[in-house]
């Protein structure tokens, strides 16, 4: 059926960058400026995306492909194809409806985007806190308290080197 249709349908010969023009006996007409067709055989072209305001043009629209946007400095992309730009915050902050707010005690954010996340609870893994957490950094968990008790170390210290000619005391 596909083969039959392509033999009968003159529009199937229209390449990307054109549309099949019903007003001109189905000849292939070039897409108007600021529009594109990324596949062949299209009856219309698509309007190019315009990167305005907080959006910045990453790739210009051509007759065969849409424009691609990213965000101006101080903002980052969200959504498929950068459909939204969201304000950056500093590390140690998260974006709320009232703007950037510092992370609450016990939480951190090490990026300019996203939300504050709770510090790791070292005790859940039977470990102790080696380095305290901050608004910008998670805690660093160390060995468990049991690992630190005298004589319980699993790491055997190296035997002291003996000097030649000295017998052990």
């Amino acid at each position: 059926f596909e083969r039959t249709r392509s033999l009968q349908d003159p529009c199937s010969n229209c390449p990307a960058g054109t549309f099949c023009d019903n007003n001109r006996n189905q000849i292939c007409s070039p897409c108007p400026p600021n529009s594109f067709s990324s596949a062949g055989g299209q009856r219309t072209c698509d309007i190019c995306r315009q990167c305005k305001g907080v959006f910045r043009t990453r790739k210009e629209c051509s007759s065969t492909s849409n424009a691609e946007c990213d965000c101006t400095p101080g903002f980052h992309c969200l959504g498929a194809g950068c459909s939204m730009c969201e304000q950056d915050c500093k590390q140690g902050q998260e974006l709320t409806k009232k703007g950037c707010k510092d992370c609450c005690f016990g939480t951190f954010n090490d990026q300019k985007r996203g939300i504050c996340r709770p510090w790791t609870n070292c005790s859940l893994d039977g470990k102790s806190v080696l380095v305290n957490g901050t608004k910008e950094r998670d805690v660093v968990c160390g060995p468990s308290p049991a690992d630190l008790s005298p004589g319980a170390s699993s790491v055997t210290p190296p035997a002291p080197a003996r000097e030649p000619g000295h017998s052990p005391q």
Epitope: F19, D21, N23, R24, S29, C31, P32, P33, N34, S35, Q42, R43, T44, C45, D46, I47
Partner: nanobody
Amino acid sequence: EVQLLESGGGLVQPGGSLRLSCAASGFTISAEDVGWVRQAPGKGLEWVSAILDFGGSTYYAESVKGRFTISRDNAKNTLYLQMSSLRAEDTAVYYCARVVYHAGGGVTFDTRGQGTQVTVSS
């Protein structure tokens, strides 16, 4: 009914100038995206220039940048194309075109006139 009537074509020597006019009726030229397309002998249509978006931003094909100027007279509902430093490769039939935006989001264009022949030859 939308009508577009082109005029101003002719035979001109290389390096010469011409001004094409397109008198529009059935729509307001200042409220539409309009422009010029051309068809050289044995070739397909090519966009030459256009005035886009109500703000009046302009588009020019790379091959005519710096040589052609598009403008419109809203009072006369007329579109113009001032062509200078003409070259043999500018020889074509020039059509006035109106960009059509469809409800489904697609875009095409209309050329209702017969076009005006521009021949650049010595």
